[in-house]
Amino acid sequence: QSSLTPLMVNGILGESVTLPLEFPAGEKVNFITWLFNETSLAFIVPHETKSPEIHVTNPKQGKRLNFTQSYSLQLSNLKMEDTGSYRAQISTKTSAKLSSYTLRILRQLRNIQVTNHSQLFQNMTCELHLTCSVEDADDNVSFRWEALGNTLSSQPNLTVSWDPRISSEQDYTCIAENAVSNLSFSVSAQKLCEDVKIQYTDTKM
């Protein structure tokens, strides 16, 4: 991406990503420099008759670095610390072309869980306090609670009253999403409230 705005590329933690490099048409390339956060990553000298010379200058990422035939950068086994700014400088006899990228690493969401802190009132109405969580959630995770296709909450928490005398069986579903994955977990209001009722009657006896 040679414009002022870097190309934003999404990578998934533990997987691979390619930063695509476009060559100036019909020009002989003298060398290519890849930089990560302004520090040299690799220096490549292409040859017409033999394999290119590739000098990896960053030992930290070195083992996970690869280059395609067109010298696009491939980074495998992505880590959170790979997040940042990448630049490729293609030098020809007449010019230097710069391509900029921003790599962000996203986690596949894992381990969705719902915790329940519910109360039973004397009128037998059950008030559900549900909290949804996923492992290593960050600010890019969106949570919502749904029932019968309606969104009841846009946060990890849901507070809702359920009256078994007037409400039919009801499932509440937490959906956690980010740009690369989504998970859901459903709980039954009837089951949760029955559990609370048992605890309630046990403490009364």
């Epitope: 921003t102 962000r104 949570f143 009841l152 990890p156 928490n157 809702v160 740009a179």
Partner: antibody, heavy 118, light 106 residues
Framework: QIQLVQSGSELKKPGASVKVSCKAS????????MNWVKQAPGQDLKWMGW????????RYADDFKGRFAFSLDKSVNTAYLQISSLKAEDTAVYFC???????????WGQGTTVTVSS | QIVLSQSPATLSLSPGERATMSCRAS?????MHWYQQKPGQAPRPWIY???NLASGVPARFSGSGSGTDYTLTISSLEPEDFAVYYC?????????FGGGTKVEIK
């Protein structure tokens, strides 16, 4: 019906503070995140951040860290935006907006105009 | 942050004409939301999750797209459709809006 009603226009001097309120009605306040959006005169919309209305935890966009503070009064279903050390560039309309999920802002306040002028 | 570029900045059309506006993201996003804003008013929710019309939005509006390219289309412009339309992404924080497309009467 579901609505967000914001406080009235404010005229402030540079260096002063302002507190904008956003009163929610018609839904369970603590179930939906509240976002704040800035629109400077003739400009685009800029997301300032949001507050979790259940936990009270605010999250700010990078450009709005420092002088900006989100808060709640759950007893009256109201969210607040406070701006301190006001500058001329804070002159704008500020909107509160409810997050319906996936950061889709389905209900907006009418906007509060804050003018900073000496 | 993800930059949203809307084009064209202005669409000058007559009632009855078809309007198509684009929103391009600097990185792939899962869905796009759209809002309509008229002078002196708050934005109104218009299309959510790429293609779902908000309550009360007429069927002449439609949304489509995936990845980095999204489109809002008005099949036949009515007088009340002349306004500014903003796209907004939710995939990454900070949530960002596009610069808007103004649909004006020719």
């Amino acid at each position: 019906q579901i609505q967000l009603v914001q406080s009235g226009s404010e005229l402030k001097k540079p260096g002063a503070s302002v507190k904008v309120s956003c009163k929610a009605s018609g839904y369970t306040f603590t179930n939906y995140g509240m976002n704040w959006v800035k629109q400077a005169p003739g400009q685009d919309l800029k997301w300032m951040g949001w507050i979790n209305t259940y936990s009270g935890e605010p999250r700010y966009a990078d450009d709005f860290k420092g002088r900006f503070a989100f808060s709640l009064d759950k007893s009256v279903n109201t969210a607040y935006l406070q701006i301190s050390s006001l500058k001329a560039e804070d002159t704008a309309v500020y909107f509160c907006a409810r997050d319906y999920g996936r950061w889709y802002f389905d209900v907006w306040g009418q906007g509060t105009t804050v003018t900073v002028s000496s | 942050q993800i930059v949203l570029s809307q084009s064209p900045a202005t669409l000058s059309l007559s009632p009855g004409e078809r309007a198509t506006m684009s929103c391009r993201a600097s990185s792939s996003v899962s869905h796009m939301h759209w809002y309509q804003q008229k002078p002196g008013q708050a934005p109104r929710p218009w299309i959510y999750a790429t293609s779902n019309l908000a309550s009360g939005v007429p069927a002449r509006f439609s949304g489509s797209g995936s990845g980095t390219d999204y489109t809002l289309t008005i099949s036949s412009l009515e007088p009340e459709d002349f306004a500014v339309y903003y796209c907004q992404q939710w995939s990454s924080t900070p949530r960002t809006f596009g610069g808007g497309t103004k649909v004006e009467i020719k």
